[in-house]
């Protein structure tokens, strides 16, 4: 059974993941972002099911494409400081949260998604899991 300190750590990590994903989404949705139309042409794989921490495997597998799209999109009005560091930070959190005991084969949905839909899906995942922690 999870201890209160391990639950607290999980909560913190999920909150940090939530903030980082929302920061990216806010940057993309910024009305001054001239690359938004182009960014929306890139397709991301969505998880068929994302209800447990181990399903973060599906997010981990899409972090490289996410980094590539964000790098392509950098401009004066859309600037995420140190995209590499940001994705690396997200990766560290994801690895800790999902654990390494069991390697899950990620099951993806048939339909791909835009970067906005992709980020919203994982933001909702974080919100949902945080809300169940006691």
């Amino acid at each position: 059974a999870p201890t209160s300190s391990s639950t607290k750590k999980t909560q913190l990590q999920l909150e940090h993941l939530l903030l980082d994903l929302q920061m990216i989404l806010n940057g993309i949705n910024n009305y001054k972002n001239p690359k938004l139309t182009r960014m929306l042409t890139f397709k991301f794989y969505m998880p068929k099911k994302a209800t447990e921490l181990r399903h973060l495997q599906c997010l981990e597998e899409e972090l490289k494409p996410l980094e590539e799209v964000l790098n392509l999109a950098q401009s004066k009005s859309f600037h995420l400081r140190d995209t590499k560091d940001l994705i690396s930070n997200i990766n560290v959190i994801v690895l800790e949260l999902k654990g390494s005991e069991t390697t899950l084969m990620c099951e993806y949905a048939d339909e791909t998604a835009t970067i906005v839909e992709f980020l919203n899906r994982w933001i909702t995942f974080c919100q949902s899991i945080i809300s169940t922690l006691t």
Partner: antibody
Framework: QVQLVQSGAEVKKPGASVKVSCKAS????????MHWVRQAPGQGLEWMGW????????NYAQKFQGRVTMTRDTSISTAYMELSRLRSDDTAVYYC????????WGQGTLVTVSS | AIQLTQSPSSLSASVGDRVTITCQAS??????LNWYRQKPGKAPDLLVY???NLETGVPSRFSGSGSGTDFTFTISSLQPEDVGTYYC?????????FGGGTKVEIK
């Protein structure tokens, strides 16, 4: 015990900048994001943004974008919030608060902007 | 941004009274809502996190409930030291937002 201790009150002229510090103790500084919240006299609370003390990554509320800069010095467990091009309506108490649930707050720093 | 509508904006009650404050979010925020009390001239203090979890050291007369868009904060028996302004705050979406506050006074 966890403590967030902020720098003292400041009086600034319109157009100037102010830098408020928040020294953390009693916990691992790099393990928790630090948020900044302000409160104008007699008003409610307004979130300004956050910094990840580990990476230095920041995210600012749209309202303050371009005017606010959040930094940190991990060697002294201190977060900083600098607000530039000050106006009279920036007169407020500025608070640092720890992580998403704001479980610990600094005592507040009154910044008065007046000509 | 998510709007939080807090009511009432102020109330006056007697010692021992049950006091209820509500907070309505403009969209679903799960249970990602916190409650704070701010005494005059002081920083806010966290009382309840994630809608219904009492922060360590907070008296059991304080409680919170709700999820989705409707939330309630209750003081079961008002004490003189409970005066101050109470704020709800959502931690579901950026920008983080606060309710307008409820000023609680003793009759």
């Amino acid at each position: 015990q966890v403590q967030l201790v902020q720098s003292g009150a400041e009086v600034k002229k319109p157009g100037a900048s102010v830098k408020v510090s928040c020294k953390a103790s009693g916990y691992t500084f790099t393990g928790y994001y630090m948020h900044w919240v302000r409160q104008a006299p007699g008003q409610g609370l307004e979130w300004m943004g956050w910094i990840n003390p580990n990476s230095g990554g920041t995210n600012y509320a749209q309202k303050f974008q371009g005017r606010v800069t959040m930094t940190r010095d991990t060697s002294i467990s201190t977060a900083y919030m600098e607000l530039s091009r000050l106006r009279s309506d920036d007169t407020a108490v500025y608070y640092c608060a720890r992580d998403l649930t704001f479980d610990y707050w600094g005592q507040g720093t009154l910044v008065t902007v007046s000509s | 941004a998510i709007q939080l509508t807090q009511s009432p904006s102020s109330l006056s009650a007697s010692v021992g009274d049950r006091v209820t404050i509500t907070c309505q979010a403009s969209q679903d925020i799960f249970n990602l809502l916190n409650w704070y009390r701010q005494k005059p001239g002081k920083a806010p203090d966290l009382l309840v996190y994630r809608a219904s979890n009492l922060e360590t050291g907070v008296p059991s007369r304080f409680s919170g409930s709700g999820s989705g868009t409707d939330f309630t904060f209750t003081i079961s028996s008002l004490q003189p030291e409970d005066v101050g302004t109470y704020y709800c705050q959502q931690s579901a979406n950026l920008p983080l937002t606060f309710g307008g506050g409820t000023k609680v006074e003793i009759k």
